[in-house]
C-alpha cells in the first residue's frame, strides 16, 4: 500500500478536514469547563480533571488514554501559618504587613482551595534587616549594584521587580549577592498597561494582585530528588539538603500596593538610571535601608511554607499511526493552574482538547494519521515542569529512537495582537507554509492570510517579507524534548504588541484574576485568536503526523548557524587583545558551519529527487531529517548543566525564559574581563568552541548519503 | 587597560553648540553609566545627566533644561555630550565619568571655552 | 536640589596634622556622600563612599564619617601629597551635587 492508500484520504483533503472540524465555540465551552475550580497540581479537583479529560478524550475516539503517575515534590503554604512581610520598629513590633491573600474577583467570593501568593519552594524561615532594591535582579543589575554603586546585598533583604528574566534567576542572583531574603512585587510599569482598567474592569492588574510562582533553578532537572529517573514507585530520592535547585533563602511575592509601602521608606543610594524606575509615587532609591527618621525600622519575613512529595497525574492519549506507529508526534500542554487558569494553561488545555476532538473525528471516519500521534495533558509544570519531564525520563529510550517532533500548547493567548512562534530552525519552513494557508482572524486583514498579518505586525529582523521567528529557551514542557533529548520542537500563541505594550507577560499572569471571564469579555470574545492558535498547532501536528516526507528544511538550519557563529565571534572580538594573546580561533566552527551548509544543500537536492514509493528509501531520508536534530545533543552536557545537552540551543544562563545560541562559548566568554584566571578563562572558550564546531560538523555528516 | 580618552578642547562663540566626545576602552561599554560632569574656573563640579548605554536612555540635570544631549554609539564604544545655546558661564573643563551614583572612573577632560 | 555645604573653604595645616573637613546637606541623605580629592590640573579621584567605605588603593590615614545631615573627611596625618581640593557629594537623591571645595594647602 501506499501511504496513501494507508491513510485513506488524500493529504491535501485530511488537512482540510481537519481543519474544518475546530469549532471557536467547543473553544470556549472547553475553556469555561477547565476554569470553574482552581486545579492547582497535586490536589483532588487537579487528578478530578485529569480523570474527566481521560474519559473525554476516549469518547473523542483515541485509541488508549492512559494516566501516568509520579511522585514529585511539590510546595505549599501552611494552611494555619500564613506567609507574609512586615516593617517591624525597633522595640520589634509589626507596624504593617502585607496582606494574606488576594480580594477574590466578583462571582468568586465563595470558591474554596484558592492557594493564597506565595513563592512554590521557598524554605522557612524569618529573616530580618534592611531592604536593599535591586530592580529586576538581573545579572546586570547585581552587576550595577556591586561594582558601580558599591552596594554590599551581603545579609540584607533585597525587594525585586517582577519582568524581564524568569523569577528562579532573580532569586539564585540574590542568593550569590548574598541576600538573606527576596521579596519579588508586580510594578505597575510592567504588568499596568495606560489606558486599561485593573480587572474586574479591564486586563490590568489591580493593586492587590499578586503573580505566583515557582523559584527553582532546576535546568532541565525535573522532580529536585530524582533527576534523571522517573519518580516513580521504586524510585531513590536523594535528601532535601541534596535536592536539585532549591532555593536556600525565604522568597515571598506581593503586590504594588503592599510594595508601595515597602518602597517609599527607602533611603540610601538615588536608584543608578531611569530604567531603574518603575510606576510607583515612590523614589525608587536603592538603599540600603529605610530613610531618616524610619532609619531603625527593619523589614521582617515571615514564610511558613512546606516541601511535600505529593502524586500528580499525565493524561497520555495515543492515535496510533497507520503506516508508521513507531514514530511519534507529540501535542502537549498542561493542566494544573495557580489558581484558575483562565489562560495559563487552561486556554491551551481547550485547544488541545478541541485538536484531539477534531483528530478523534476524523479516525472515526476511518483516517488515521501516517504516524502516530501522542496527546498528552501534563500535570505540575508550574512547579518546575514537572509532569513532562518525568513521563520524558521514563519514556527517554523510546522517544529519543521514535520522537519526530514536540509542539507545545501552553497558553494561547498572552495578547491578541498577532502570532508568536518560537521553533527549531527545521519547522520554520512548515510554519510559513501552514500560516500561508490559514486566514488572519486579525481586525484589517480579512480576506488575507495568517502569514500577512504576522509578518506585517511582527516582521523578521533580518529577513524581510518573512515573519520573526524566535528560539526556543525554557519554562514551558517542551524543556525536556528539546533541550535534553533532542527532538524538533515548536510552539504558537496569539501575543501582544511588543512595540506598545512594554510589560512583562500579561498583567494578570499567575494571579486569581485569571479567569474565564478575563479571556471571554477582554482577550479574545469571539474566541476567534484560540481558533486561530487552534489551526497553527493542529495543523503543524497534522502535517508532522501525515506528510510524506517530514517536513523538515535542514538548510534553515545552516541559515542559521552561520548567523549565531558570527554573532559569537563578534561577542568574542570584543577582547580583540586576549584573543591574539591566547591564541583563540573559531576557524574549526566557521569550518563546519560551511561545510554543514553544503551538506544540507545536496541532502535538500536528493530530497526532492529520491523515489517515495520505495519505503525503506523514503524511511532512510525521513530518519536522516529526523535525527539531525539529535544529532546536536552532546550526551556530556553543558558545563553544570547536564540536562541541557543541545549544543545549539541552551535557555539563557541569565534567564531560563530567552534562548541562547552557542550557550557553551556564550557563557565562557560571559563577563571573561573580571575572571580571575583570564588563561583559565580563555581554554575554556577553547574548548567550546570545539566542541560546538565537532558538534555542528558531526551533525552534518548524518545528513551525508549514508554510503 | 581601562581608558576613558575625551576629545581635544574647543572655542565656541555664544549660541553655538558643541559636541564633546568620550572613547571608552578596557571595559564592557554598555555595562557602566557614562555620566557628564563639568567644573567651570574656580567652580565646584556640577552633574549634567548620565545615559545607560545599554539602552540608550538618559537622565538629565533639569538645570540645563533641554540644552544637552546625551549620546552613545555602542559600536564605537563612545559617549557624546551636546550643549546647544552656549553662553560665556558655559566654559568650563567638561568631564565623562564612569559609573552609577559614584565616579570612580574619569576622562581626562575637555576644556570648552565660550567667547565672542 | 540638595545643597552640599563645605567648611572650611580652604585651609592650612602641617605635615602630620589631623585635618578634618566637614559637609552639611541642605536635607537628609542618609550615608549616601562620597568624598573627592582633585589635586592642580588632574582629574578628580574617588577616595571614600557611603560616608565611611574608603575606595581601592586609597590610603588609610582617610576617613570619612556621618549619616543624614552632616559627614565628616579626616586625615589623620597629613601628608605632602595631600595637597589639593576635596569635594563632597551626595547620591541620595537627583540631581547629583558637589559641595563648593575644600582647599588644602601645606604651611
Known amino acids: 500500500k501506499s501511504s496513501n492508500e494507508a491513510t485513506n484520504i488524500t493529504p491535501k483533503h485530511n488537512m482540510k478536514a481537519f481543519l474544518d472540524e475546530l469549532k471557536a465555540e467547543n473553544i470556549k465551552k472547553f475553556l469555561y469547563n477547565f476554569t470553574q475550580i482552581p486545579h492547582l497540581a497535586g490536589t483532588e479537583q487537579n487528578f478530578q480533571l485529569a480523570k474527566q479529560i481521560q474519559s473525554q478524550w476516549k469518547e473523542f475516539g483515541l485509541d488508549s488514554v492512559e494516566l501516568a503517575h509520579y511522585d514529585v515534590l511539590l510546595s505549599y503554604p501552611n494552611k494555619t501559618h500564613p506567609n507574609y512581610i512586615s516593617i517591624i520598629n525597633e522595640d520589634g513590633n509589626e507596624i504593617f504587613n502585607t496582606s494574606l491573600f488576594e480580594p477574590p474577583p466578583p462571582g468568586y467570593e465563595n470558591v474554596s482551595d484558592i492557594v493564597p501568593p506565595f513563592s512554590a519552594f521557598s524554605p522557612q524561615g524569618m529573616p530580618e534587616g534592611d531592604l536593599v532594591y535591586v530592580n529586576y535582579a538581573r545579572t546586570e543589575d547585581f552587576f550595577k549594584l556591586e561594582r558601580d554603586m558599591k552596594i554590599n546585598c551581603s545579609g540584607k533583604i533585597v525587594i525585586a521587580r517582577y519582568g524581564k528574566v524568569f523569577r528562579g534567576n532573580k532569586v539564585k542572583n540574590a542568593q550569590l549577592a548574598g541576600a538573606k531574603g527576596v521579596i519579588l512585587y508586580s510594578d505597575p510599569a510592567d504588568y499596568f498597561a495606560p489606558g486599561v482598567k485593573s480587572y474586574p474592569d479591564g486586563w490590568n492588574l489591580p493593586g492587590g494582585g499578586v503573580q505566583r510562582g515557582n523559584i527553582l533553578n532546576l535546568n532541565g532537572a525535573g522532580d529536585p530528588l530524582t533527576p534523571g529517573y522517573p519518580a516513580n514507585e521504586y524510585a531513590y530520592r536523594r535528601g532535601i539538603a541534596e535536592a536539585v535547585g532549591l532555593p536556600s533563602i525565604p522568597v515571598h511575592p506581593i503586590g504594588y500596593y503592599d510594595a508601595q509601602k515597602l518602597l517609599e521608606k527607602m533611603g540610601g543610594s538615588a536608584p543608578p538610571d531611569s530604567s531603574w524606575r518603575g510606576s510607583l509615587k515612590v523614589p525608587y532609591n536603592v538603599g540600603p535601608g529605610f530613610t531618616g527618621n524610619f532609619s531603625t525600622q527593619k523589614v521582617k519575613m515571615h514564610i511558613h511554607s512546606t516541601n511535600e512529595v505529593t502524586r500528580i497525574y499525565n493524561v497520555i492519549g495515543t492515535l496510533r499511526g497507520a503506516v508508521e506507529p513507531d514514530r511519534y508526534v507529540i501535542l502537549g500542554g498542561h493542566r494544573d493552574s495557580w489558581v484558575f487558569g483562565g489562560i495559563d494553561p487552561q486556554s491551551g488545555a481547550a485547544v488541545v482538547h478541541e485538536i484531539v476532538r477534531s483528530f478523534g473525528t476524523l479516525k472515526k471516519e476511518g483516517w488515521r494519521p501516517r504516524r502516530t500521534i501522542l496527546f498528552a495533558s501534563w500535570d505540575a509544570e508550574e512547579f518546575g515542569l514537572l509532569g513532562s519531564t518525568e513521563w520524558a525520563e521514563e519514556n527517554s529510550r523510546l522517544l529519543q529512537e521514535r520522537g519526530v517532533a514536540y509542539i507545545n500548547a501552553d497558553s494561547s493567548i498572552e495578547g491578541n495582537y498577532t502570532l508568536r512562534v518560537d521553533c527549531t530552525p527545521l519547522m520554520y519552513s512548515l510554519v510559513h507554509n501552514l500560516t500561508k494557508e490559514l486566514k488572519s482572524p486579525d481586525e484589517g486583514f480579512e480576506g488575507k492570510s495568517l502569514y500577512e498579518s504576522w509578518t506585517k505586525k511582527s516582521p523578521s529582523p533580518e529577513f524581510s517579507g518573512m515573519p520573526r521567528i524566535s528560539k526556543l529557551g525554557s519554562g514551558n514542557d517542551f524543556e525536556v524534548f528539546f533541550q535534553r533529548l533532542g527532538i524538533a520542537s515548536g510552539r504558537a500563541r496569539y501575543t501582544k504588541n511588543w512595540e506598545t505594550n512594554k510589560f512583562s507577560g500579561y498583567p494578570l499572569y499567575h494571579s486569581v484574576y485569571e479567569t474565564y471571564e478575563l479571556v471571554e469579555k477582554f482577550y479574545d470574545p469571539m474566541f476567534k485568536y484560540h481558533l486561530t492558535v487552534a489551526q497553527v498547532r493542529g495543523g503543524m501536528v497534522f502535517e508532522l503526523a501525515n506528510s510524506i516526507v517530514l517536513p523538515f528544511d535542514c538548510r534553515d538550519y545552516a541559515v542559521v548557524l552561520r548567523k549565531y557563529a558570527d554573532k559569537i565571534y563578534s561577542i568574542s572580538m570584543k577582547h580583540p587583545q586576549e584573543m591574539k594573546t591566547y591564541s583563540v580561533s573559531f576557524d574549526s566552527l566557521f569550518s563546519a558551519v560551511k561545510n554543514f551548509t553544503e551538506i544540507a544543500s545536496k541532502f535538500s537536492e536528493r530530497l526532492q529527487d529520491f523515489d517515495k514509493s520505495n519505503p525503506i528509501v523514503l524511511r532512510m531520508m525521513n530518519d536522516q531529517l529526523m535525527f539531525l536534530e539529535r544529532a546536536f545533543i552532546d550526551p556530556l552536557g553543558l558545563p553544570d548543566r547536564p540536562f541541557y545537552r543541545h549544543v545549539i540551543y541552551a535557555p539563557s544562563s541569565h534567564n531560563k525564559y530567552a534562548g541562547e545560541s552557542f550557550p557553551g562559548i556564550y557563557d565562557a566568554l560571559f563577563d571573561i574581563e573580571s575572571k580571575v584566571d583570564p588563561s583559565k578563562a580563555w581554554g575554556e572558550v577553547k574548548r567550546q568552541i570545539y566542541v560546538a564546531a565537532f558538534t555542528v560538523q558531526a551533525a552534518a555528516e548524518t545528513l551525508s548519503e549514508v554510503a | 587597560e581601562f581608558q576613558l580618552v575625551q576629545s581635544g578642547a574647543e572655542v565656541k562663540k555664544p549660541g553655538a553648540s558643541v559636541k564633546v566626545s568620550c572613547k571608552a576602552s578596557g571595559y564592557s561599554f554598555t555595562d557602566h553609566n557614562m555620566n557628564w560632569v563639568r567644573q567651570a574656573p574656580g567652580q565646584r563640579l556640577e552633574w549634567m545627566g548620565l545615559?545607560?548605554?545599554?539602552?540608550?536612555?538618559?537622565d538629565y540635570n533639569q538645570k540645563f533644561k533641554g540644552r544637552v544631549t546625551l549620546t552613545v554609539d555602542q559600536s564605537a564604544t563612545t559617549a557624546y555630550m551636546e550643549l546647544s545655546s552656549l553662553r560665556s558661564e558655559d566654559t568650563a573643563v567638561y568631564y565623562c565619568?564612569?559609573?552609577?551614583?559614584?565616579?570612580?572612573?574619569w576622562g581626562q577632560g575637555t576644556l570648552v571655552t565660550v567667547s565672542s | 536640589d540638595i545643597q552640599m555645604t563645605q567648611s572650611p573653604s580652604s585651609l592650612s595645616a602641617s605635615v602630620g596634622d589631623r585635618v578634618t573637613i566637614t559637609c552639611k546637606a541642605s536635607q537628609g541623605v542618609d550615608t549616601a556622600v562620597a568624598w573627592y580629592q582633585q589635586k592642580p590640573g588632574k582629574v578628580p579621584k574617588l577616595l571614600i563612599y557611603w560616608a565611611s567605605t574608603r575606595h581601592t588603593g586609597v590610603p588609610s590615614r582617610f576617613s570619612g564619617s556621618g549619616s543624614g545631615t552632616d559627614f565628616t573627611l579626616t586625615i589623620s596625618s597629613l601628608q605632602p601629597e595631600d595637597v589639593a581640593t576635596y569635594y563632597c557629594q551626595q547620591y541620595s537623591r537627583y540631581p547629583l551635587t558637589f559641595g563648593q571645595g575644600t582647599k588644602l594647602e601645606i604651611k
Open positions: 545615559i545607560n548605554p545599554n539602552y540608550g536612555t538618559a
Open positions: 565619568a564612569r559609573g552609577s551614583s559614584l565616579f570612580a572612573y
